[in-house]
Interface confidence: low
């Protein structure tokens, strides 16, 4: 008759580091002491006729245990395979690129340390909850990779790595471990440089707007803009509208920046940079300044008119150019009555990079002269009809401007000058028209001959 040696439990599954109670039993009536062969730490707990119970502790790896006993001089054996399972000690998704260009591939890389049995361990790479790759864990540490084409939709998306230890066939369930997620930042930076709108010339101490625009940028809000005039950084206001970024700044040139300069616009995104440069000439254009030796001159006095401007500026005063750029234009005159109110014009021209810039300035001369009444405008003999409306058209001139009054000889009767009035016979007579100012008096005699109104 053949006797059996049973080992229980048969093919157990337990967690790493755990303990296991093993029972070996036989139906052989004349069996000797039952032995348990194993590399594991074991302890005989109890035994009796045809049976023995052992405790196995700190079971860390898969093992085969063997029970043996001598029955009627023959050895009979029984075995059981222990499967140990353990969760991974570390599941780590490698850092993603700080910025990933849209349309280019990047590699997701997950490292898994520990976890057994490896045959039941799967590594899954995820975007949000979408599975990108599912692979078995092989080496120790296991490394799983997946190549992903970056899209705009991936910006801000979390990527993670999940391990699945499937012990469901053994009735223990599915054990899941997930790495800390890593967020991807994707970007689009066009190859074209920004559009830079800036002045060609900029005068010292003046301000001018500078605009820098770049289209097709994603995410535009993450881009950094640097605008500068030479080495002077400009305070830019950055606006995003969709995929367009616009930076606006005001460029103000300093005196120490005179000469050829560059306006630079840098747009940086995802560690890449696009740059636009425009040449600009900072210039200083002083004047022109027109001066009179005497702004208010006496009739007959000599007046000097001069016009000056900054270096390299050519000035022309009343059509007379200065000898050379940077020099003063000058003219002299004897002040006469006709020069009163005369304007002297000075034009200044500066050449900046082949372009001619023009500025004008003028000054007005005042000449002081005594009062005069223009005989041509003041008829000395007037023939008017009674009871008609007329104007005494007399004009005086002088600087300062004189007061003009026409008084009837032998009486204090005054006729208005330059204003319509009704003429009657009483206006008949000789009038003294006198222009007076602080510079003297001038008198002209005017005779009014009033013809009586005829009733027939």
């Amino acid at each position: 008759q053949e006797f059996l040696l049973r080992v229980e439990p048969q093919n157990p599954v337990l967690s790493a580091g755990g303990s296991l109670f093993v029972n070996c039993s036989t139906d052989c009536p004349s069996s000797e002491k039952i032995a348990l062969e194993t590399s594991l730490s074991k302890e005989l707990v109890a035994s009796g006729m045809g049976w023995a119970a052992f405790n196995l502790s700190n079971v860390t790896g898969n093992s085969r245990i063997l029970c043996s006993v001598y029955c009627n001089g023959s050895q009979i054996t029984g075995s059981s395979n222990i499967t140990v399972y353990g969760l991974p000690e570390r599941v780590e998704l490698a850092p993603l690129p700080p910025w990933q260009p849209v349309g280019q591939n990047f590699t997701l890389r997950c490292q898994v340390e520990g976890g057994s049995p490896r045959t039941s361990l799967t590594v899954v790479l995820l975007r949000w909850e979408e599975e990108l790759s599912r692979q078995p864990a092989v080496e120790e540490p296991a490394e799983v990779t997946a190549t992903v084409l970056a899209s705009r939709d991936d910006h801000g998306a979390p990527f993670s790595c999940r391990t699945e230890l499937d012990m469901q066939p053994q009735g223990l369930g599915l054990f899941v471990n997930t790495s800390a997620p890593r967020q991807l930042r994707t970007f689009v930076l066009p190859v074209t440089p920004p559009r830079l709108v800036a002045p060609r010339f900029l005068e010292v101490e003046t301000s001018w707007p500078v605009d820098c625009t770049l289209d097709g940028l994603f995410p535009a809000s993450e881009a950094q803009v640097y605008l500068a005039l030479g080495d002077q950084m400009l305070n830019a206001t950055v606006m995003n509208h969709g995929d367009t970024l616009t930076a606006t700044a005001t460029a103000t040139a300093r005196a120490d920046q005179e000469g050829a300069r560059e306006i630079v616009c840098n747009v940086t995104l995802g560690g890449e940079r696009r740059e636009a440069r425009e040449n600009l000439t900072v210039f200083s254009f002083l004047g022109p300044i027109v001066n009179l030796s005497e702004p208010t001159a006496h009739e007959g006095s000599t007046v000097t008119v001069s016009c000056m401007a900054g270096a390299r500026v050519q000035v022309t005063l009343d059509g007379v150019p200065a000898a050379a750029p940077g020099q003063t234009a000058q003219l002299q005159l004897n002040a006469t009555e006709s020069d009163d109110g005369r304007s002297f014009f000075c034009s200044a021209t500066l050449e900046v990079d082949g372009e001619f810039l023009h500025r004008n300035s003028s000054v007005q001369l005042r000449v002081l002269y005594g009062p005069k009444i223009d005989r041509a405008t003041c008829p000395q003999h007037l023939k008017w009809k009674d009871k008609t409306r007329h104007v005494l058209q007399c004009q005086a001139r002088g600087n300062p401007y004189p007061e003009l009054r026409c008084l009837k000889e032998g009486s204090s009767r005054e006729v208005p000058v330059g204003i319509p009035f009704f003429v009657n016979v009483t206006h008949n007579g000789t009038y003294q028209c006198q222009a007076s100012s602080s510079r003297g008096k001038y008198t002209l005699v005017v005779v009014m001959d009033i013809e009586a109104f005829s009733s027939h």
Epitope: E89, R90, A94, P95, R109, E113, P141
Partner: antibody
Framework: QVQLVQSGAEVKKPGASVKVSCKAS????????ILWVRQAPGQGLEWMGK????????TYAQKFQGRVTITADTSTSTAYMELSSLRSEDTAVYYC????????????WGQGTLVTVSS | DAVMTQTPLSLPVSLGDQASISCRSS???????????LHWYLQKPGQSPQLLIY???NRFSGVPDRFSGSGSGTDFTLKLSRVEAEDLGVYFC?????????FGGGTKLEIK
């Protein structure tokens, strides 16, 4: 046997950069992590950062963030540590060391590289 | 950061004496995986540091059994049962549970 051999001493001016190399031999370079530690004259040890050559991933101490760059060339089994914007207080001996993932200790060290920052 | 405080700063001993160095951390060094990453290094004069003990109490290969480590949580101790001339130098404790890794200030073991 495991060896980490570092580049020679350097003298640099303030504001300059220095790049120290560490050549590994006697083990598989991508199996271990390389760390950088410095020691100012007569002072203690200060951890700067580490690199996993297998992944190419780095971790830096906050204090050196932005100034230090640790790289690894797996083809030559060499790790590099570059420190920029040097100042006089960066004068120190710079060590590279390696560690296995477990035990998480620095089991082998390079011989050290003295970097002197002086104007 | 985990601040590591070592005492004493200097430890004068006679050869053959027992020596004990203490290391205290400002936060627990028990990792979420259950391990405690506290290590001890010795730096002999003019040399690089060398690993003595890793993970609290494990002697690194080639380290004599007169060195032993103990402790848990935040308090740790390195013991030398019989000091020999080759043991002289500066001892550092270090943790790698938390980033950044940090070191104690060092304890100088010297002859009385």
């Amino acid at each position: 046997q495991v060896q980490l051999v570092q580049s020679g001493a350097e003298v640099k001016k303030p504001g300059a950069s220095v790049k120290v190399s560490c050549k590994a031999s006697g083990y598989t370079f991508t199996d271990c992590i390389i760390l950088w530690v410095r020691q100012a004259p007569g002072q203690g040890l200060e951890w700067m950062g580490k690199i996993n050559p297998y992944f190419g991933t780095t971790t830096y101490a906050q204090k050196f963030q932005g100034r230090v760059t640790i790289t690894a060339d797996t083809s030559t089994s060499t790790a590099y540590m570059e420190l920029s914007s040097l100042r006089s207080e960066d004068t120190a001996v710079y060590y590279c060391a390696r560690k296995e993932a477990y035990p998480d200790a620095m089991d082998y060290w390079g011989q050290g590289t003295l970097v002197t920052v002086s104007s | 950061d985990a601040v590591m405080t070592q005492t004493p700063l200097s430890l004068p001993v006679s050869l053959g004496d027992q020596a004990s160095i203490s290391c205290r951390s400002s936060q627990s060094l028990v990792h979420s995986n259950g391990d405690t990453y506290l290590h001890w290094y010795l730096q002999k004069p003019g040399q690089s540091p060398q690993l003595l003990i890793y993970k609290v109490s494990n002697r690194f290969s080639g380290v004599p059994d007169r060195f032993s480590g103990s402790g848990s949580g935040t308090d740790f101790t390195l013991k030398l049962s019989r000091v020999e001339a080759e043991d002289l130098g500066v001892y550092f404790c270090s943790q790698s549970t938390h980033v950044p890794y940090t070191f104690g200030g060092g304890t100088k073991l010297e002859i009385k």
